[in-house]
C-alpha cells in the first residue's frame, strides 16, 4: 500500500483503518443529496513474513512473501488490500436533475488482507 | 504494493509482472514432486489519480485515491493487487510419505488492479 512512504520504523501489520469520507470534502455535495458522507475505511500496513491467519493471505501472497525475502530488490511484498467490501445507497441528482436512489457496490472496506 | 521501497522517480502504473517461481529456490523440493516451479507472476506499480479503466479499480479505490490527493500524509494510495488468480495442480508427499495430487487455489496472478 503506501508505496511512496519512507519510514525508518517498523510499520504495523496489515489491518483495516477507520476513515470517514465527507462528500463535501470530495466536492460532490452538489450532486449527492444523501448521505453527507460515509465510513469508507481503508487498508494499510505491512504484509511481512510470516503471514499469520489474521492477514487473510492468498496462497499466492504466501509464495510472494517468500520470494520477496530472497529477492527484495526485484519482487515487492504482497500488499494490504480490501478482502471484503460493502455497498452503500446514495441519493443523487442525475444529469437531467432527476433524483435517483442507487446502490454503489464496493464502497466500504469491511476487512483487509495480504494480496 | 512495494511499501518498503523508496524511489525518487515516477513508478509505472499498476500491472502484472512475470515471475517464475522455482520450488527448489523456496526450499520445497523435498516435498513437491511436480511441477519443479510455476509462473506465479505478481502485481506492482502505482495506483495514482486518475485511475483509468485498465486498472480495474473498485469504487472504494476511486474514493481512496481522491482522499489520498487531499490527505497524502494520512491515507495511502490504493494498492496494486491481484484481481484474478488461477489454481495449479501439485504432486507432493504428505506427512506419511503418500503421493498426493492436489489443486492449490489462488496461486497464479492472471490480472492486477487498484484496490
Amino acid at each position: 500500500s503506501a508505496s511512496d512512504y519512507n519510514s525508518s520504523e517498523l510499520k504495523t501489520a496489515c489491518r483495516k483503518h477507520e476513515l470517514y469520507v465527507s462528500f463535501q470534502d470530495l466536492g460532490w455535495q452538489d450532486w449527492i443529496i444523501a448521505p453527507k458522507g460515509y465510513a469508507a475505511n481503508y487498508c494499510d500496513g505491512e504484509c511481512s513474513f510470516p503471514l499469520n491467519a489474521h492477514m487473510n493471505a492468498t496462497n499466492h501472497a504466501i509464495v510472494q512473501t517468500l520470494v520477496h525475502l530472497m529477492n527484495p530488490e526485484y519482487v515487492p511484498k504482497p500488499c494490504c488490500a480490501p478482502t471484503k467490501l460493502n455497498a452503500i445507497s446514495v441519493l443523487y441528482f442525475d444529469d437531467n436533475s432527476n433524483v435517483i436512489l442507487k446502490k454503489y457496490r464496493n464502497m466500504v472496506v469491511r476487512a483487509c488482507g495480504c494480496h | 504494493s512495494a511499501s518498503d521501497y523508496n524511489s525518487s522517480e515516477l513508478k509505472t502504473a499498476c500491472r502484472k509482472h512475470e515471475l517464475y517461481v522455482s520450488f527448489q529456490d523456496l526450499g520445497w523440493q523435498d516435498w513437491i514432486i511436480a511441477p519443479k516451479g510455476y509462473a506465479a507472476n505478481y502485481c506492482d506499480g502505482e495506483c495514482s489519480f486518475p485511475l483509468n479503466a485498465h486498472m480495474n479499480a473498485t469504487n472504494h479505490a476511486i474514493v481512496q485515491t481522491l482522499v489520498h490527493l487531499m490527505n497524502p500524509e494520512y491515507v495511502p494510495k490504493p494498492c496494486c493487487a491481484p484481481t484474478k488468480l488461477n489454481a495449479i495442480s501439485v504432486l507432493y508427499f504428505d506427512d506419511n510419505s503418500n503421493v498426493i495430487l492436489k489443486k492449490y487455489r489462488n496461486m497464479v496472478v492472471r490480472a492486477c488492479g487498484c484496490h
Epitope: 525475502l69 530472497m70 530488490e73 | 512495494a2 522455482s22 529456490d25
Partner: antibody, heavy 118, light 107 residues
C-alpha cells in the same frame, strides 16, 4: 566482460558528505541490482543498501537510514552512494556489487577508501 | 536477521595441504550460501554459490558442501595464491548476512 569501476579514494572531515560512483560495463545495467557494502579496517563486510537499476527502487540498512542515498544514472550505467554526516567510524572501504535475481553478489567494484579525519 | 558464524577464525596450513573451512547459519538457509575470497587490498571474489557450484573461472580445487545450517568450503591442495580471508554469506532471507571470515595463512 562484466566490470564495476569505482571512483577514487576520498578524505573527508567529520560532518561532511561523500559520494562514491560505480560505473558498470559488460552487461545490461538495468537488469540487475547494485548493492553497497562497506568494510571498516579489520571488520566484516557490512551491507548498506541497494538500488534496482531498472526501476530505481532503493532500500537502506536501518543503521544508515537518513544518512545514505543511493541513486543511479541509466544513461551512464552508473550507480552512486552518498553518505552524509560523516564520522570517524565511517572510515572504511566502500564496495559496490552486482546482484541478479536469486543470486549472490557475483561481481564487485575494486573498492573506494573513504577516510574521515579532522 | 540470520547470524553467520565461521570457524576457525584463523587456519594455518602448509602449501599443498587440504584446508577445510566451516560456516554455520543461525537458521536454515536451504542451499543459498556463497563463499568469497578476499586478498589484502582487493575486493571480495565470488568462489562458490548455491552451496556447491563454482563461479566462473574458479579452479576445481575449491569445493563446497552442506545444507540447512552447516556448510563447508574445502580447498583440496592449497596453492600460494589461496592464502587469503574467506567469507561465507547467506542469500536466502533478507537481509543477506556475511560471516566474520576465516583467515587462511601459511604454516
Amino acid at each position: 566482460q562484466v566490470q564495476l569501476v569505482q571512483s577514487g579514494a576520498e578524505v573527508k572531515k567529520p560532518g561532511a558528505s561523500v559520494k562514491v560512483s560505480c560505473k558498470a560495463s559488460g552487461y545490461t545495467f538495468t537488469s540487475y541490482a547494485i548493492h553497497w557494502v562497506r568494510q571498516a579496517p579489520g571488520q566484516r563486510l557490512e551491507w548498506m543498501g541497494w538500488i534496482n537499476a531498472g526501476n530505481g527502487n532503493t532500500k537502506y540498512s536501518q543503521k544508515f537510514q537518513g544518512r545514505i542515498t543511493i541513486t543511479r544514472d541509466t544513461s551512464a550505467s552508473t550507480a552512486y552512494m552518498e553518505l552524509s554526516s560523516l564520522r570517524s567510524e565511517d572510515t572504511a572501504v566502500y564496495y559496490c556489487a552486482r546482484r541478479g535475481f536469486g543470486e549472490p553478489f557475483d561481481y564487485w567494484g575494486q573498492g573506494t577508501l573513504v577516510t574521515v579525519s579532522s | 536477521e540470520i547470524v553467520m558464524t565461521q570457524s576457525p577464525a584463523t587456519l594455518s596450513v602448509s602449501p599443498g595441504e587440504r584446508a577445510t573451512l566451516s560456516c554455520r547459519a543461525s537458521q536454515s538457509i536451504s542451499s543459498n550460501l556463497a563463499w568469497y575470497q578476499q586478498k589484502p587490498g582487493q575486493a571480495p571474489r565470488l568462489l562458490i554459490y548455491g552451496t556447491s557450484t563454482r563461479a566462473t573461472g574458479i579452479p576445481a580445487r575449491f569445493s563446497g558442501s552442506g545444507s540447512g545450517t552447516e556448510f563447508t568450503l574445502t580447498i583440496s591442495t592449497l596453492q600460494s595464491e589461496d592464502f587469503a580471508v574467506y567469507y561465507c554469506q547467506q542469500y536466502n532471507i533478507w537481509p543477506f548476512t556475511f560471516g566474520p571470515g576465516t583467515k587462511v595463512d601459511i604454516k
